[in-house]
C-alpha cells in the first residue's frame, strides 16, 4: 500500500507535470504565436487508455516528437529551451511511471493535434491528482 509520503510525492510530481504541460499549451495557444497553424499539422499518437500512472509510457514515447514541434515554435513564452523543458517532463514521467514493470503502450487509431494531445494529458493529470487521498 502506498504510504502517506509516497502519495504526497506522487501528488507533487503530477502537479508539476500538470503545470509544465499547461505552460506548453498556453505558450503555443498564445495569440502571438505565428507558427500555430503549422504546428497543428503535426500529428501525435493518443493513448487508447490513460487511467493509471503506468499509462504515462504513452506520453514518454511522444516526448521526442513534442520537442521537435516546440523547436519549430521557438516561443519566448517558455523561458526554457524545448530540450530542457522536455527533459524536465521526462524526469517527472520516469519517476511517476516507475521502471519496475514494462508496459506496452496501446495507441488509439486516430491521431491528434498538439493541442488535443496536450489537453488529453492535462486531463489525465487532473484526474489522477483528484483521486489521490
Amino acid at each position: 500500500a502506498p504510504t502517506s509520503s509516497s502519495t504526497k510525492k506522487t501528488q507533487l510530481q503530477l502537479e508539476h507535470l500538470l503545470l509544465d504541460l499547461q505552460m506548453i499549451l498556453n505558450g503555443i495557444n498564445n495569440y502571438k504565436n505565428p507558427k500555430l497553424t503549422r504546428m497543428l499539422t503535426f500529428k501525435f499518437y493518443m493513448p487508447k487508455k490513460a487511467t493509471e500512472l503506468k499509462h504515462l509510457q504513452c506520453l514518454e514515447e511522444e516526448l521526442k516528437p513534442l520537442e521537435e514541434v516546440l523547436n519549430l515554435a521557438q516561443s519566448k513564452n517558455f523561458h526554457l529551451r524545448p530540450r530542457d523543458l522536455i527533459s524536465n517532463i521526462n524526469v517527472i514521467v520516469l519517476e511517476l511511471k516507475g521502471s519496475e514493470t514494462t508496459f506496452m503502450c496501446e495507441y488509439a487509431d486516430e491521431t491528434a493535434t498538439i493541442v488535443e494531445f496536450l489537453n488529453r494529458w492535462i486531463t489525465f493529470c487532473q484526474s489522477i491528482i483528484s483521486t489521490l487521498t
Epitope: 507533487l12 502537479e15 503545470l19 505552460m23 517558455f78 484526474s127 491528482i129 483528484s130
Partner: antibody
Framework: QVQLVQSGAEVKKPGASVKVSCKAS????????MHWVRQAPGQGLEWMGW????????NYAQKFQGRVTMTRDTSISTAYMELSRLRSDDTAVYYC????????WGQGTLVTVSS | AIQLTQSPSSLSASVGDRVTITCQAS??????LNWYRQKPGKAPDLLVY???NLETGVPSRFSGSGSGTDFTFTISSLQPEDVGTYYC?????????FGGGTKVEIK
C-alpha cells in the same frame, strides 16, 4: 519547519521596477515550484505566475507577460519576482507561496507605487 | 480562465453557529479546489485542499466537500478566532484563480 521569508516594504515611483525576494528554509528548495500572488488594498488574491527552482523554468499569467520576471538563486534558496514599468494600480502586497496547493506562504511584501 | 463565484461575499454569525460558504466554478475542475482563511494583515492559510482534505493542524470543525463545479466549505461551530476572509482557489487550470472571498464576522 518550512518558512518563506520575504524582503521588506518598498516605495517606488511610476515607471520604476521592484524586485521582491523570498527566502525558503526547512525543505528542499528545488523540489517545489514557487508561485507569486498579489493582493491590492482591500481586494482579493491574484495569481501572477510560477518558477521551477530546479530548472529556472517560468510561466506567467498573461496579464503580467512582458512586465514580470521570476528568477531564483538555488545557492541561497531564494526566489525573486521583479515587476517593471510600475503603475499606481500595482500597489499591493506581494506573496510567494509554495506549490499548487499554496501550503506555505511568505509574510508578504507591501509595494507602494506613488509619485 | 476559470471563474470562481463565491457566496456570500460576507456574513455575520454567532459563536457556535454553523457557517456554510459555496464556490462555483465556471467549468469542471474535478476536485482540484482549495480553501484558505486570511486574517487582517496576514498571509492566507491553507485549510482544505482538493475539496475535502483537511490540512495538517487545522481544527476538525472545518470541512469541505464537492467536485466538478460546485463546492462547499463549512465551519460546524463558529469560534471567535475564525473571523477573517475565506477564499476558494482552483488548481486545475492555468491561470490559477481565486474566488472573490467571503468575509466572516462574529455577531
Amino acid at each position: 519547519q518550512v518558512q518563506l521569508v520575504q524582503s521588506g516594504a518598498e516605495v517606488k515611483k511610476p515607471g520604476a521596477s521592484v524586485k521582491v525576494s523570498c527566502k525558503a528554509s526547512g525543505y528542499t528548495f528545488t523540489g517545489y515550484y514557487m508561485h507569486w500572488v498579489r493582493q491590492a488594498p482591500g481586494q482579493g488574491l491574484e495569481w501572477m505566475g510560477w518558477i521551477n527552482p530546479n530548472s529556472g523554468g517560468t510561466n506567467y499569467a498573461q496579464k503580467f507577460q512582458g512586465r514580470v520576471t521570476m528568477t531564483r538563486d538555488t545557492s541561497i534558496s531564494t526566489a525573486y519576482m521583479e515587476l517593471s514599468r510600475l503603475r499606481s494600480d500595482d500597489t499591493a502586497v506581494y506573496y510567494c507561496a509554495r506549490d499548487l496547493t499554496f501550503d506555505y506562504w511568505g509574510q508578504g511584501t507591501l509595494v507602494t507605487v506613488s509619485s | 480562465a476559470i471563474q470562481l463565484t463565491q457566496s456570500p461575499s460576507s456574513l455575520s454569525a454567532s459563536v457556535g453557529d454553523r457557517v456554510t460558504i459555496t464556490c462555483q466554478a465556471s467549468q469542471d475542475i474535478f476536485n482540484l479546489l482549495n480553501w484558505y482563511r486570511q486574517k487582517p494583515g496576514k498571509a492566507p492559510d491553507l485549510l482544505v485542499y482538493r475539496a475535502s482534505n483537511l490540512e495538517t493542524g487545522v481544527p476538525s470543525r472545518f470541512s469541505g466537500s464537492g467536485s466538478g463545479t460546485d463546492f462547499t466549505f463549512t465551519i460546524s461551530s463558529l469560534q471567535p478566532e475564525d473571523v477573517g476572509t475565506y477564499y476558494c482557489q482552483q488548481s486545475a487550470n492555468l491561470p490559477l484563480t481565486f474566488g472573490g472571498g467571503t468575509k466572516v464576522e462574529i455577531k
